[in-house]
């Protein structure tokens, strides 16, 4: 049985390392739910489509989220 069908949370480990917003393909923020009790942040990198779980409590990741949301608000009309 694939792991993804049997577990509630996606992240096995979380990274505290800063991520360059330019190297990001996509950033998913999955809020807590009945399936997983905590927020999960999954970054899809441009390089080889690598996906990385980020630590929501990390200062570097909080700064990344701010930078990404600022970028989005600039783009929206």
């Amino acid at each position: 049985i694939p792991l993804s069908r049997t577990v509630r949370c996606t992240c096995i480990s979380i990274s505290n390392q800063p991520v360059n917003p330019r190297s990001l393909e996509k950033l998913e923020i999955i809020p807590p739910s009945q399936f997983c009790p905590h927020v999960e942040i999954i970054a899809t990198m441009k390089k080889k489509g690598e996906k990385r779980c980020l630590n929501p409590e990390s200062k570097a990741i909080k700064n990344l989220l701010k930078a990404v949301s600022k970028e989005r608000s600039k783009r929206s009309p």
Epitope: L3, S4, T6, V7, C11, I12, S13, K48, K51, R52
Partner: antibody
């Protein structure tokens, strides 16, 4: 530096129990999934169990399911393996290993840090 | 359970030669879920490759991984004396995680 140190191995009779510990240092233990992997004398590697970073999700190899329990204490930076109803075929070197930073069900970064191993011998 | 079969069981080569190690899965494995490890006698395994083709930190450029689906390859472009060891592939796309039986790379 980043380090994992296993302890608790020894000689034990079949049917008895043993608890292995793995002390982590040099990194934020609570951010990483952790594994136990074993290697019987002269044989290859066999994955035993995994526990997610926050401890809520655990998986086991069929060969140990119902007998072994993986757990962790993030406040003590320690991983455990409780082994009950031990059998001769459980004789092996037991390694703890760290799952790479950011690993998920979508993409794995491998077991990037390993301990030196602790030897468990099950014999009457 | 996904079974990984490595070949050859033993590979005898000389330093400077190219080594090609194969890992075949009994069912399809996402390339993001395959790793290679090196193990020397009396030592713990060392991660070489993750995601089928990405080198782990500190691994020399002579090591490379490739493949997808059911067929994966570890290549060592030019063997150094310290490369003679046992190599394992591992999948972790489905539980239980499994290792191949290993390929022993020995000096000819």
């Amino acid at each position: 530096q980043v380090q994992l140190v296993e302890s608790g191995g020894g000689v034990v009779q079949p049917g008895r129990s043993l608890r292995l510990s793995c002390a982590a240092s040099g990194f934020t233990f609570s951010s990483y999934g952790m594994h136990w992997v074993r290697q019987a004398p002269g044989k290859g590697l066999e994955w035993v169990a995994v526990i997610w970073f926050e401890g809520s999700i655990k998986y086991y190899a069929d060969s140990v399911k119902g007998r072994f329990t993986i757990s962790r204490d993030n406040s003590k930076n320690t991983l455990y393996l409780q082994m009950n109803s031990l059998r001769a075929e459980d004789t092996a070197v037991y390694y703890c290993a760290r799952e790479g930073a950011g690993s998920s069900l979508y993409y794995y970064y491998g077991m990037d840090v390993w301990g030196q191993g602790t030897t468990v011998t099950v014999s009457s | 359970e996904i079974v990984l079969t490595q070949s050859p069981g033993t590979l005898s080569l000389s330093p400077g030669e190219r080594a090609t190690l194969s890992c075949r899965a009994s069912q399809s494995v996402s390339s993001g879920h395959l790793a290679w490890y090196q193990q020397k006698p009396g030592q713990a395994p060392r991660l070489l490759i993750y995601g089928a083709s990405s080198r782990a930190t500190g691994i020399p450029g002579r090591f490379s991984g490739s493949g997808s689906g059911t067929d994966f390859t570890l290549t060592i472009s030019r063997l150094e004396p310290e490369d003679f060891a046992v190599y394992y592939c591992q999948q972790y796309g489905s539980s239980p995680y499994t290792f191949g039986q290993g390929t022993k790379l020995e000096i000819k």
